[in-house]
């Protein structure tokens, strides 16, 4: 299911105290995501069948137009705000992909499982980024954009948009893991 995507609470009220070594945990989660991103991408395009596996550049290239930007040379605060936006975008996109794949590829259980596991880590990452932004930087609100709504697309477009998103995810998660 899609991530809960409420923006950072304006009052910055955190219900639970943040974990110790919060930045280490964020780094660990990014490393975990980076370590599994390529396997998820391969699992996805393989499950879609032809023409996807033989047309990756054309159908799965990471050309996602409205993807939130990231600047690796920014301050920690700026990078965390951008990371927050990216995780929200990826979370909603992953939710859409998971929903679509349950309909399009109901028997691809290993794909469903990997999508769900990735979404779980993203949820934890979102929570930790939020904690860090609130506790250290008192950032009470971040404007976010959500992933594209694929619900009204045809079969091919659903598959293609999912493949492009996961191609972008694989690319950006490597950058993020390096930047923190």
């Amino acid at each position: 299911s899609p991530l809960p995507i409420t923006p950072v609470n304006a009052t910055c009220a955190i219900r639970h105290p943040c974990h110790n070594n919060l930045m280490n945990q964020i780094r660990s989660q990014l490393a975990q995501l980076n370590g599994s991103a390529n396997a998820l991408f391969i699992l996805y395009y393989t499950a879609q069948g032809e023409p996807f596996p033989n047309n990756l550049d054309k159908l799965c290239g990471p050309n996602v137009t409205d993807f939130p930007p990231f600047h690796a040379n920014g301050t920690e605060k700026a990078k965390l705000v951008e990371l927050y936006r990216i995780v929200v975008y990826l979370g909603t996109s992953l939710g859409n992909i998971t929903r679509d794949q349950k309909i399009l590829n109901p028997s691809a259980l290993s794909l469903h499982s990997k999508l769900n596991a990735t979404a779980d880590i993203l949820r934890g990452l979102l929570s930790n980024v939020l904690c860090r932004l609130c506790s250290k930087y008192h950032v009470g609100h971040v404007d976010v954009t959500y992933g594209p709504d694929t619900s009204g697309k045809d079969v091919f477009q659903k598959k293609k948009l999912g493949c492009q998103l996961l191609g972008k995810y694989k690319q950006i998660i490597a950058v993020l893991a390096q930047a923190f």
Partner: antibody, heavy 121, light 110 residues
Framework: QVQLQESGPGLVKPSDTLSLTCTVS?????????WSWIRQPPGKGLEWIGY?????????YYNPSLKSRVTISVDTSKNQFSLKLSSVTAADTAVYYC????????????WGQGTLVTVSS | DIQMTQSPSSLSASVGDRVTITCRAS??????LAWYQQKPGKVPKLLIY???TLQSGVPSRFSGSGSGTDFTLTISSLQPEDVATYYC????????????FGGGTKVEIK
């Protein structure tokens, strides 16, 4: 029982705009349905015109050969969707069907009875 | 731009015959193919979807097979009430596609 019913004028003059409405009853417009128009010229095969998705994205797809002349819109409060085809000619004379397709929209499982529209002066 | 080609365009067979209609897509459509039956003056009726799944209420003498680009509709034992035109329809990609339907196959009794 779900029913789709087309309505609109049976005779349209050349160069005018053809307007048809499809009323869906026994079924609340679902956000996971596509509502389509399909036509069939006399003695010929089926031709897909386009669809509208009744969800937040409001996606529409149109047959490229008709795209410049076609508009499909929806009125969810009335459970209706409509077709407008501009600058009609005799070649647009056909039985027009409205149809519905369930997610992932790969086949049409709901059909109206069809209405014959003749383009003639 | 996916083109759907049906063959033959018409056929005549005897009651009890096995009848086969083929549909070819110009590029892969995976298994997203449907078959419809249209009797004269009537609304098209969905027979088979996802290449081989029989729609509820359709007689078991109708079957579908195929994947990728080549598909077949088979009537195992032709009955008088099967006289109709049969259409295939791809449901894989509607973008930039002039017609998702095949040209039709008219089935008559000898």
């Amino acid at each position: 029982q779900v029913q789709l019913q087309e309505s609109g004028p049976g005779l349209v003059k050349p160069s005018d705009t053809l307007s048809l409405t499809c009323t869906v009853s026994g079924f609340s417009f679902s956000t996971d349905y596509w509502w389509s128009w399909i036509r069939q010229p006399p003695g010929k095969g089926l031709e897909w015109i386009g669809y509208i998705y009744v969800g937040t994205s409001g996606d529409t797809y149109y047959n490229p050969s008709l795209k410049s002349r076609v508009t499909i819109s929806v009125d969810t409060s009335k459970n209706q969707f409509s077709l407008k085809l501009s600058s009609v000619t005799a070649a647009d004379t056909a039985v027009y069907y409205c149809a519905g397709a369930d997610n992932p929209y790969d086949y049409f499982n709901l059909w109206g009875q069809g209405t014959l529209v003749t383009v003639s002066s | 731009d996916i083109q759907m080609t049906q063959s033959p365009s018409s056929l005549s067979a005897s009651v009890g015959d096995r009848v086969t209609i083929t549909c070819r897509a110009s590029e892969t459509i995976s298994g997203y193919l449907a078959w419809y039956q249209q009797k004269p003056g009537k609304v098209p009726k969905l027979l088979i979807y996802r290449a081989s799944t029989l729609q509820s209420g359709v007689p078991s003498r109708f079957s579908g097979s195929g994947s990728g680009t080549d598909f077949t509709l088979t009537i195992s034992s032709l009955q008088p009430e099967d006289v109709a035109t049969y259409y295939c329809q791809q449901g894989y990609s509607y973008s930039d596609t002039d017609n998702v339907f095949g040209g039709g196959t008219k089935v008559e009794i000898k």
